[in-house]
Amino acid sequence: GPVPPSTALRELIEELVNITQNQKAPLCNGSMVWSINLTAGMYCAALESLINVSGCSAIEKTQRMLSGFCPHKVSAGQFSSLHVRDTKIEVAQFVKDLLLHLKKLFREGQFN
């Protein structure tokens, strides 16, 4: 059956934890992505940012997991109003910021 939202969010958090803990060389060769506003709709915004990183196996699972939280199909080059335009950060920092925010949501019981 379908995975409960709390389980899906926990699994996404655990995957981001795994990425941050196992990071040896610069994540995705130091690729830069658009920063996003961590507000409503941020799952799609996060996916829109990360989907523009290609050839980085470390975040492929995260990209797939985020697509499960985003109700519409996301493709490379697509940008929503949730991006902080003109502000790019390294993928590693993006992941850390997203991880902290998702933990906060998880602990507040906001699973969707």
Epitope: R10, I13, E14, V17, T20, Q21, K96, L100, K103, F106, R107
Partner: nanobody, 126 residues
């Protein structure tokens, strides 16, 4: 929501020992630290010791060699074995769950604290 429950505090003579326990109910992620802080009357809360999921331990200089922190990941419990206690160790001891600060500092100076316990009183008489 995680709850932290401390136990093991009490009154002890200088040179004696106590073992504090802190049991956490709820989810603690593997990158998070569990640790102990203390606050003496009229003083600021200060770091005592911390431990991560992998068992790496960190101590304040004032307790090194006397206190030992350990963690049972299966039980989500952290312990603080306090030996050779001194009157200056008298304080309320608090358990905490926290993220290391952005530069990875495990001492919680700039950490993101998720949870604090209610505290347990340790009094060391001379």
């Amino acid at each position: 929501q995680v709850q932290l429950q401390e136990s093991g505090g009490g009154l002890v003579q200088a040179g004696g020992s106590l073992r504090l326990s802190c049991a956490a109910s709820g989810t603690i992620f593997v990158d998070e630290f569990m640790g102990w802080y203390r606050q003496a009357p009229g003083k600021e809360r200060e770091f005592v010791a911390s431990i991560n999921d992998g068992g790496s331990t960190y101590y304040a200089d004032s307790v090194k060699g006397r206190f030992t922190i350990s963690r049972d990941n299966a039980k989500n419990t952290v312990y603080l074995q306090m030996n050779s206690l001194k009157p200056e160790d008298t304080a309320v001891y608090y358990c905490a769950v926290f993220e290391p600060s952005p530069d990875g500092d495990p001492f919680g100076d700039r950490a993101w604290f998720w949870y604090w316990g209610q505290g347990t009183q340790v009094t060391v008489s001379s």
